[in-house]
């Protein structure tokens, strides 16, 4: 699977993580920081 960084217009899309673009699937994906989950790394897990 080819992966690139998301374009700059996606800055802030991932609240607690890094935005990556899955080229083959044409989908953006957030790689969350440790302790976070959710589509946009929006949830801290207790």
């Amino acid at each position: 699977v080819q992966i690139t960084k998301c374009s700059s217009d996606m800055d802030g899309y991932c609240l607690h993580g890094q935005c990556i673009y899955l080229v083959d699937m044409r989908e953006k994906f957030c790689r969350c920081e440790v302790g976070y989950t959710g589509l946009r790394c929006e949830h801290f897990f207790l």
Partner: antibody, heavy 118, light 112 residues
Amino acid sequence: QVQLQQSGPELVKPGASVKISCKASGYTFTDAYINWVKQRPGQGLEWIGWIWPGPVITYYNPKFKGKATLTVDKSSSTAYMLLSSLTSEDSAFYFCARREVLSPFAYWGQGTLVTVSA
Amino acid sequence: DVLMTQTPLSLPVSLGDQASISCRSSQSIVHSTGNTYLEWYLQKPGQSPKLLIYKVSNRFSGVPDRFSGSGSGTDFTLKISRVEAEDLGVYYCFHGTHVPYTFGGGTKLEIK
């Protein structure tokens, strides 16, 4: 309009498994979480977990890890919940509910009653 | 997990009265965005829960203005200014800030 249509009631034996469904319509299926909520007869609501349909991400309430397994079929815009090793404690209504990122449960399914009995 | 404690368990009211339900979280449910994802739902017998209030004080579309939500940090309140027959049922608070999400135990609003 957004609709979540759940499968019908299930009567299952202890130790067995059951798979219930929640068919979504009226919105883009891959644009919201499908959550599942348990309600034992006469009792309160318990949150089981959520699944984001694409790319698939799941999160389970630790209490339900190993009991519930959430999956989706994107082609039919349907979410599923498999409940395994059933006991009488699993007899309950199960609701699916749609939730966008950091948004409330604005839409709910009608509920599926699962009865576990020998 | 965040424990959501609702009081009272049962609330007998006369039609036209004001009703107040309290919900307390065991820890702060303020999100890193600064928002508080505290919601209120009403479940009538034999029905699915229905959204009333989200983000502490925002009424969902179609919800009458006699319903209001308030609070901050760990203490939240749902008020119904003039109770009508259609308001009877079980009210649940809910937090969606951290995972796992949790519901309060419910408050049954019933006729005195």
